[in-house]
């Protein structure tokens, strides 16, 4: 007997589609074994038709896929297209075709019902719209049209010229009678339900001279597109409802154990808390199609997806729906990456941002979600340099550490940067992560002077106070510009006496600008780091001025002003198209800033680095 | 309120043949997997046949020991659902039971994927 398990017989008609899932025990060698589904030959041999392996055989190109869930014990067939040629005995297993665990599938694809001798058939999702077409002699032209909905041996009347509407398909239906010439009626029916399902007669005219044409409209529950996605990744539906209801409201819901679909994201600004900051409903384009993206995928997102148009904002019978079941892989090729980082009132994060390795030469973005209305996601950095302008000084993008993980350090933190923040870049979509970063209570580790003036021509020399932990961390000094922080040559000087409570391995690492000159204006930061890790940084703005006394000048924290105000964003700031979601600007506003001078050259000293303890704050 | 309400057990000798039928309302759902499960005297809940529905495409499942015996069958929209019992053995007798869920996801075989059950009807086969 096989521990593999499928449903023995499977029936589905022409056209149609078929998921079949196969249940295996999910033991290690199991799991990352061979799955596949076979056709069995009069022979008896077992012909592979799909794998897991990503064989397809000819006869299933483009329209059958095989998809392993190991850590269910689960794979799924999919067959699209059905036809009655697929009709036969198949097995799914596992290994080896010929020897190995496997299960004896029947699929049977019919032709669907008996209908009378010139049915016109009319397959429709519920929700959307049908016009059925009814020709009628010459001699019918002027005689009443009509159009009956058969039930058993019964013709209910569901519309007719003389202004006759039967309530159940009432303020959704209308019959048009075209101008002269035009030999042909048409009934319209908008916001299909499934029980507008049936048999439907046309007639026009009355007596044995009577037009007669049957119509057969099948009203469908879309069948659910099928989506993998891996866990603390993106996933986005795509949503086109048509143009009818392209001024309604829209909606994503999620299929509840009741059946009733609970409300994700609409456009009335309703949304769950289970997605708060990590969810966008993309603006609808012209035709009334949107776009939802969710990142930071759980295991708890799977289910059943509904998008939807309706004035209310929520799923109603009768209006156009489309549908998507959604699996959450929990072997994710998507690394571990904290889900909220920790930062100190005017200390800084460092947040590692995950991106596909395949793609290393992908621009890089770093974007603050916004909850109001369907959520927003305007760009604060990306990798070409760009940064806001009241990010300026205190935000860099560094492709480092490289191989599938870049790193964005922001600094000077206050409690209005507490929020969401997505790590995106302009390929693999599927790659986008959320993270949430938390102001908590504390003092910045790092200690600089607020703000420094310098004097054209002479000798500046910048403090930065380390606490003990840092003793086995690099040391680093840089100047920001709007492109990176470019590294400076830096002195370590001992220990200091910023940290009362601290043995002697705390430390002093000075910048020195000797001779000062006008491009030495602008930001600067000290920071840590552990190889391509970084930690905690501390900014302080130059401000150079002329020469007013001779000699050199020391800044020491006691003498240090508060750091220059933020600038604020300007009106002016225009808003990025969103281009469906390849453009991973997700409503980006976006502001190009000017350099902020020439960046130093120079080699730092060095200084010791080993592991490190913290990153970016704590991390939990 | 929901009800599922089993129907056509009975006694039967070994050999003999038997369709049980069930019926659901008050389902807040066209039921997208209906399944018969078995509880003989002292024992777990087990597997029998199950029936699942996506579209115009339907699913059946059989545990091993009924196959080639036993024919399970519904009406998705009407929310019933039949097993036909063919060669009868002593060791099907158990009370069983009619179980519904919304969706087809999750092992048919297990018990715990189903949302709403019947009071059960008994099968008893001997001679």
């Known amino acids: 007997k096989s521990p593999v398990f499928g449903p023995q017989e499977v029936s589905s008609v022409e056209g149609n589609s078929v998921s079949i899932k196969c249940y295996y025990p999910p033991t290690s060698v199991n799991r990352h074994t061979r799955k596949y589904w076979c056709r069995k030959g009069a022979s008896g041999r077992c012909i592979t038709l799909v794998s897991s392996e990503g064989y397809v055989s000819s006869n299933y190109a483009g329209r059958a896929n095989l998809t392993n869930f190991p850590e269910n014990g689960t794979f799924v067939v999919n067959i699209a297209q059905l036809s009655r040629d697929d009709s036969g005995h198949y097995k799914c297993g596992l290994g080896i075709n010929s020897r190995g665990l496997s299960f004896d599938v029947s699929l049977e694809v019919s032709q669907g019902p008996e209908l009378p001798n010139g049915t016109e058939v009319y397959t429709v999702d519920v929700g959307r719209t049908v016009t059925i077409k009814c020709p009628f002699k010459t001699e019918n032209a002027p005689k009443t049209k009509a159009l009956y909905k058969k039930i058993g041996q019964t013709s209910v009347l569901v519309i007719d010229s003389r202004n006759y509407v039967n309530p159940n398909y009432k303020d959704r239906i209308r019959l048009r009678i075209p101008g002269t010439g035009q030999l042909i009626f048409t009934v319209v029916i908008d916001r299909l339900r499934l029980s507008d399902h049936g048999l439907y007669l046309c007639q026009a005219g009355d007596g044995s001279n009577r037009d007669e044409k049957n119509a057969d409209l099948q009203v469908l529950e879309p069948e659910p597109e099928l989506v993998y996605e891996d866990l603390r990744g993106s996933v986005t539906f795509h949503c086109a409802l048509g143009l009818e209801v392209a001024n309604v409201a829209k909606f994503l819901c999620r299929v509840n154990s009741r059946e009733t679909c609970d409300v994700v994201i609409n456009t009335l600004g309703k949304r769950d808390s289970a997605f708060e900051g990590r969810i966008l409903l993309n603006p609808q384009d012209k035709d009334g199609s949107f776009s939802v993206v969710i990142t930071g995928l759980r295991k708890e997102d799977e289910g059943r997806y509904l998008c939807g148009a309706h004035s209310d904002g929520q799923l109603q019978e009768g209006w156009p729906i489309q549908a998507w079941q959604l699996f959450v892989n929990e072997e994710s090729t998507i690394p571990r990456s904290p889900t909220v980082v920790k930062g100190v009132a005017g200390g800084s994060v460092a947040v590692l941002c995950p991106y596909n390795p395949k793609e290393s030469q992908s621009l890089k973005y770093w974007c603050l979600w916004e909850g109001a209305q369907n959520g927003r996601c305007p760009l604060l950095v990306e990798s070409q340099g760009l940064v806001q302008e009241q990010y300026e000084g205190r935000l860099s993008l560094l492709q480092e550490p490289g191989n599938g993980t870049f790193t964005v350090i922001l600094n000077q933190l206050t409690t209005q940067d507490a929020g969401f923040y997505w790590c995106l870049t302009n390929g693999d979509t599927r790659w986008r992560t959320t993270v949430e970063i938390k102001i908590i209570e504390g003092e910045p580790n790092l200690k600089v002077p607020g703000n420094v003036t310098a004097v054209l021509g002479e000798t500046l020399n910048i403090p930065c106070h380390f606490p003990c932990k840092f003793s086995s961390y690099e040391k680093y000094w840089c100047k920001w510009s709007n492109t990176g922080c470019q590294t400076l040559p830096s002195q370590d000087e001992g220990p200091s006496e910023a940290f009362v409570n601290c043995d002697e391995n705390s430390r002093l690492v000075s910048l020195t600008l000797n001779p000062v000159t006008r491009a030495d204006e602008g930001w600067y930061w000290c920071g840590v780091k552990q190889g391509h890790f970084y930690g905690e940084t501390a900014a302080v703005y130059v401000a150079v001025e002329e020469k007013k006394v001779a000699g050199s000048r020391y800044v020491s924290p006691a003498k240090a002003d508060a750091a220059p105000d933020e600038k604020v964003l300007d009106s002016g700031v225009r808003e990025i198209e969103n281009k469906a979601i390849q453009d991973p600007r997700l409503f980006a506003e976006e502001k190009v800033v000017a350099d902020t001078g020439d960046q130093a050259g120079g080699s730092r000293a060095s200084v010791d680095s080993s592991s490190s303890e913290e990153q970016g704050g704590s991390s939990k | 309120q929901v009800q599922l309400v089993e129907s056509g057990g009975g006694l039967v000798q070994p050999g003999g043949s038997l369709r049980l039928s069930c019926v659901a309302s008050g389902l807040p759902f066209s039921s997208s997997r209906m399944a018969w499960f078995a509880q003989a005297p002292g024992k777990e809940r087990e597997f029998v046949a199950a029936i699942g529905w996506r579209g115009r495409t339907s699913y059946k499942y059989y545990a091993d020991s009924v196959k080639g015996r036993f024919t399970v069958s519904g009406d998705n929209a009407k929310k019933t659902l039949d097993l036909q019992m063919k060669d009868l053995k002593p060791e099907d007798t158990a009370l069983y039971f009619c179980?519904?869920?919304?969706?087809?996801?999750?092992?048919?075989?297990?018990?715990?994927?189903?949302?709403?059950w019947g009071q059960g009807t008994q099968v008893t086969v001997s001679s």
């Open positions: 179980a519904a869920h919304p969706n087809d996801d999750g092992d048919p075989r297990i018990s715990g994927n189903y949302q709403y």
